[in-house]
């Protein structure tokens, strides 16, 4: 219902007589003054009941210095309480009074929800000057009010340091429902009930909601705003929306994109970066992550040769970064390598299967029967030593590596020797005589130097001394060598 | 508990018109709308329409438009189904039904047989 | 105007079998719900929204199925299970019920 704007009884009249700009008397209302063109008078509501008393804030009354004449107490006149009115309209509305002339230097502000308005507003304060009295009429106009001009307006004038103010004048600006909340794109588990949150104001109030999935409208019977939709679960991708609708009409939110968390898809371009002996270094582009984190992967490894029994060994790694190191392998031997990450819903399928070689090891054991003795004649010593029996992986033998330590009082040197893959004997200059040599010898291949056979050593005499007895390590075991002098 | 009432077994005779009631209770009324179902002797279960509780509007399906009028007193929480112009094809089981989101008929009151018979 | 066939029309099983009825439709719908009704009695909600037990109902029956294809289980049929069953769907107005599967005892 619209009330009429009404004017109260007042304790002082508007004008005294007649105003220039066809403003008229006391018992007019305000929604007849003049306003700037292209207004367009809004619905109006009186702030307080007709026929009550004026109770606002009001300048007590004084005795004036020329006589015993007692002023009137000063007053903002009654304006419209309640204005109502679309988004992207003008509004013009205003607050007057009348102050006797004995008062100087008067100025009223506007203030809007308990704050001064300053600076780029359009407030006009216009003054009509009589005998005794000057009107004066403040004027605020807002163009294409927006939502946020919203709220409680009200004059206020400072008089001799008293303070009057204006009842207050509510603009109230009506549109479309606007969303304070619309519902978020989620990853949900399939067959799972999940929340949808909608959320708009007006005004106009109420706010009805209708939700809508892919393009069919949930509920039939909208509900009040904020409404919660409780989806029962989902089978596949789906798009909501919520239409919000008021008085005024509707306004339609985001589409949300509803995904269903899946298994990944599995990874792709499985890379060898680097491959060793004993490990190989892969890397991986991950798959799709089925809307789900990943969680980690699984490196799976097989080697590729008909005689092994086929078994596949599984090294889990974290899903990133997208790089392991798998270790533990076997010297030049084949593998085909595999990779799947996991996701709180499981499991990707393999990847595409690579194949990967590591490359000749080390040599694992050591030449066998090393024997030592010394020729005075040459002054050399002479090693022998038989090729030991190495693993195919450990690939083609290249050489050998002799290590020779010469210890005297307080002396000590080690010296290194290589020979070639033919060669089962050396001989190495007698160093330092009155000394003992201790020898060690290593298969060498492509993949490295092999393990050190066990020490043998053997004493080197004095020039004069004669020794042809060998030393020698026992063929099969590690059993201390006996030394012969 | 949620209940849905229906007003009794109705006999009535081509070209009157007879009026079902359906009652409910334990609930908002005006929260969810209210579906009118018909199930003819040995047949299966047709859609007729609902009503918007908060409303007043109805809303027919194709079959149910011209002499079918669905109406509400939210005061007594009652929805109602208006048949006017009755024919024999129209004798059948009516039944109220609580309509949820999703088209789901979670509530169906007991049923209203009309028959059509000169 | 979306049709939903369900198969079998008749359906005769034994107390303790598992038995599974179909609803077809004739485009792809959001969701499927079903409903029970016992002779001379109203309609009972079973399954909503395609997977989702009704209040009350025993954990012997579910439901599953997307797109055009739905399924209504019953794990293992009780004597109070021998009823018609209806499906209902949602996503393109107006909601339309399948025909009926009747399942009577063997």
């Known amino acids: 219902a619209i009330t009429e704007a009404r004017e109260e009884a007042k304790p002082y009249p508007l004008f005294p007589g007649p105003l220039p700009g066809s403003l008229q008397t006391d018992h007019t209302s305000l929604l007849s003054l003049p306003h700037t063109s292209g207004y367009q008078p809004a619905l109006m509501f009186s702030p307080t009941q007709p026929g009550r008393p004026y109770t606002g804030n009001v300048a007590i009354p004084r005795v004036t210095s020329a006589g015993s004449k007692l002023l009137p107490p000063l007053a903002f006149k009654h304006t419209v309480g309640h204005i109502i009115l679309s988004e992207h309209k003008d509004v013009k509305f205003n607050c007057s009074i009348s102050v006797p002339n004995i008062y100087q230097d008067t100025t009223i502000s506007w203030w809007k929800d308990g704050k001064e308005l300053l600076g780029a507003h359009h407030a006009i304060t216009q003054f009509y000057p009589d005998d005794e009295v000057t009107a004066i009429i403040a004027s605020f106009s807002i163009t294409s009010v927006q939502r946020s001009d919203n709220g409680s307006y009200i004059c206020k004038m400072k008089i001799n340091n008293e303070e009057i103010v204006s009842d207050p004048i509510y603009i109230e600006v009506q549109g479309l429902p606007h969303f304070t909340k619309q519902p978020e794109s989620m990853n949900v588990t399939r067959n799972t009930a999940f929340n949808l949150t909608c959320q708009a104001v007006g005004p106009p109030e109420p706010v009805n909601i209708f939700w809508v999935q892919n393009s069919s409208r949930v509920n039939e019977q909208p509900e009040k705003s904020p409404s919660v939709l409780t989806v029962p679960g989902l089978t596949e991708m789906a798009v909501f929306s919520c239409e919000a609708h008021n008085d005024k009409g509707l306004t339609v939110s985001k589409g949300v994109q509803i995904n269903i968390k899946a298994i990944p898809s599995p990874p792709t371009e499985v890379s060898i970066h680097n491959s060793t002996a004993h490990s190989i270094l892969i890397s991986w582009v991950p798959g799709f992550d089925g809307y789900s984190p990943f969680r980690n992967c699984s490196v799976q490894v097989k080697e590729v040769d008909p005689l092994s029994n086929g078994s596949v060994m599984i090294f889990n790694t974290s899903a990133s970064p997208h790089m392991y190191q798998i270790k533990q392998l076997q010297a030049l031997a084949n593998y085909s390598i595999g990779v799947s990450c996991m996701n709180e819903i499981g499991w990707s399928a393999v990847s595409p299967w690579i194949l990967a070689s590591t490359t000749e090891g080390a040599p694992s054991v050591a030449p066998l029967n090393v024997t030592v003795f010394l020729n005075e004649s040459r002054d050399n010593v002479d090693i022998r030593w038989m090729k030991p029996l190495t693993k195919r992986q450990a690939g083609e033998l290249v050489g050998y590596r002799i290590s020779h330590v010469w210890q005297s009082a307080g002396i000590s040197k080690e010296l290194l020797e290589e020979v070639g893959q033919n060669n089962s004997r050396a001989q190495i200059s007698v160093q330092v005589h009155n000394a003992t040599c201790t020898v060690r010898i290593a298969a060498v291949t492509k993949g490295g130097v092999g393990p050190f056979s066990d020490p043998v050593k053997i004493f080197i005499p004095a020039h004069g001394w004669v020794d042809h007895a060998p030393s020698s390590t026992p063929a099969p075991g590690n059993a201390d060598p006996v030394l012969i002098i | 508990q949620v209940q849905l009432v229906q007003s009794g077994s109705e006999l009535k005779k081509p070209g009157a018109s007879v009026k079902v009631s359906c009652k409910a209770s334990s609930y908002t009324f005006t929260t969810y709308g209210m579906s009118w179902v018909r199930q003819a002797p040995g047949q299966g279960l047709e859609w007729m329409g609902w009503i918007n509780t908060a409303s007043g509007v109805p809303t027919y399906t194709d079959d149910f438009k011209g002499r079918f009028v669905f109406s509400l007193d939210t005061s007594v929480s009652t929805a109602y189904l208006q048949i006017s112009s009755l024919k024999a094809e129209d004798t059948a089981v009516y039944y109220c039904?609580?309509?949820?989101?999703?088209?789901?008929?979670?509530?169906w009151g007991q049923g209203t047989l009309v028959t059509v018979s000169s | 105007d979306i049709q939903l066939t369900q198969s079998p029309s008749f359906l005769s099983a034994s107390v303790g079998d598992r038995v599974t009825i179909t609803c077809r439709a004739s485009?792809?719908?959001?969701?499927m719900h079903w409903y029970q009704q016992e002779p001379g009695k109203a309609p009972k909600l079973l399954i909503y929204?395609?997977?989702n037990l009704a209040q009350g109902v025993p954990s012997r029956f579910s439901g599953s199925g997307s797109g055009t294809e739905f399924t209504l289980t019953i794990s293992s049929l009780q004597p109070e299970d021998f009823a018609t069953y209806y499906c209902q769907q949602w996503g393109s107005l107006p909601f339309t019920f399948g025909q009926g599967t009747k399942l009577e005892i063997k």
């Open positions: 485009s792809s719908v959001g969701y």
């Open positions: 929204a395609t997977s």
């Open positions: 039904a609580r309509y949820t989101n999703y088209g789901v008929f979670d509530y």
